[in-house]
C-alpha cells in the first residue's frame, strides 16, 4: 500500500516520490474538474 510522509506532502509510491497535494500553481490538472490554462 502507498505510504505517506504527511510532514512533507510527498507520497512514496512504487519507490518514486510524487508530490500529491499539488499547490494552486500546478498546471497539470491535479485538481479534479479544475479548468487549467487554455484549451489546447
Amino acid at each position: 500500500d502507498a505510504e505517506f510522509r504527511h510532514d512533507s506532502g510527498y507520497e512514496v509510491h512504487h519507490q518514486k516520490l510524487v508530490f500529491f497535494a499539488e499547490d494552486v500553481g500546478s498546471n497539470k490538472g491535479a485538481i479534479i474538474g479544475l479548468m487549467v490554462g487554455g484549451v489546447v
Epitope: A2, F4, H6, D7, G9, E11, K16, V18, F20, A21, D23, V24, K28, G29, A30, I31, I32, G33, L34, M35, V36, G37, V39, V40
Partner: antibody
C-alpha cells in the same frame, strides 16, 4: 466544442474484464492528468486513480491497485481504464476527468 | 484513509433563503504550506459532477459568488447565500491531502 466522450454502457459477467475509453474532442489529452472516478448506484464518488499522459505515470487508490489499469493513447487523444476480475460490486457509473472537463459517464453493469 | 463526513444527508431549502452544508474530515487538511486541501463538488440531477470550490475557499471558474466555503483544519461549511432552483443536486466535499476521498453527499432539494 471541447468535451470528453466516453464509450457506451457495458454489461459483463462476473470475472470478466472491461475497457472503458475516454476520447478528447477538441482537446489535447496529453496536456493534463486524466482522473478516473466511479459512482456506485445511489452512492457517492470514489476516486480510482489518475494518469499523466505525458509519461504514463499512474497513481491509484490502494483498493483499485489490482483492479484498474489506466493507459493513454496520445495519438488518438484517448484515455482508457481497464477493470479486471469484475464483481457485482463493480457495477457503477465510471467517469473520466481532465482539466475542467468531465466525461458523460459510462455505466458498467456486472451481472450473471 | 481520510474519512469525510457530511451533514445533513438531506437538506430541503427555500428559494431565496440561505443554506449551509457541513463537512468534517478525520484528519486536518491544513498542510504546513498553508493550503487546506478541501473541495466541494455539485452533481446536478442527470449530470456529471462539477467543481464548485477548491482548496477550501477558492471559487472555481463560472461558479456564482453566492457560494462560499470556510472552515478550520477539520470542520468545513459550504454556504449558499440565496438558494436558486438551479442549485438543487447532491453536494460532495472531498480532500486530496492524501489521494482523494469524498463525503457521502448531501442532497439539496427545494421544499
Amino acid at each position: 466544442q471541447v468535451q470528453l466522450v466516453q464509450s457506451g454502457a457495458e454489461v459483463k459477467e462476473p470475472g470478466a474484464s472491461v475497457k472503458v475509453s475516454c476520447k478528447g474532442s477538441g482537446f489535447n489529452i496529453k496536456t493534463y492528468y486524466v482522473h478516473w472516478l466511479r459512482q456506485l448506484p445511489e452512492k457517492g464518488l470514489e476516486w480510482i486513480g489518475r494518469i499523466d499522459p505525458e509519461n504514463g505515470e499512474t497513481i491509484y487508490t490502494p483498493k483499485f491497485q489490482d483492479k484498474a489499469t489506466l493507459t493513454v493513447d496520445t495519438s488518438t487523444d484517448t484515455a482508457y481504464m481497464e477493470l479486471s476480475s469484475l464483481r457485482s460490486e463493480d457495477t457503477a457509473v465510471y467517469y473520466c476527468v481532465s482539466s475542467g472537463y468531465w466525461g458523460q459517464g459510462t455505466l458498467v453493469t456486472v451481472s450473471s | 484513509d481520510i474519512v469525510m463526513t457530511q451533514s445533513p444527508l438531506s437538506n430541503p431549502v427555500t428559494p431565496g433563503e440561505p443554506a449551509s452544508i457541513s463537512c468534517r474530515s478525520s484528519k486536518s487538511l491544513l498542510h504546513r504550506n498553508g493550503i487546506t486541501y478541501l473541495y466541494w463538488y455539485l452533481q446536478k440531477p442527470g449530470q456529471s459532477p462539477q467543481l464548485l470550490i477548491y482548496q477550501m475557499s477558492h471559487l472555481a471558474s463560472g461558479v456564482p459568488d453566492r457560494f462560499s466555503s470556510s472552515g478550520s483544519g477539520t470542520d468545513f461549511t459550504l454556504k449558499i447565500s440565496r438558494v436558486e432552483a438551479e442549485d438543487v443536486g447532491v453536494y460532495y466535499c472531498a480532500q486530496n491531502l492524501e489521494l482523494w476521498t469524498f463525503g457521502q453527499g448531501t442532497k439539496v432539494e427545494i421544499k
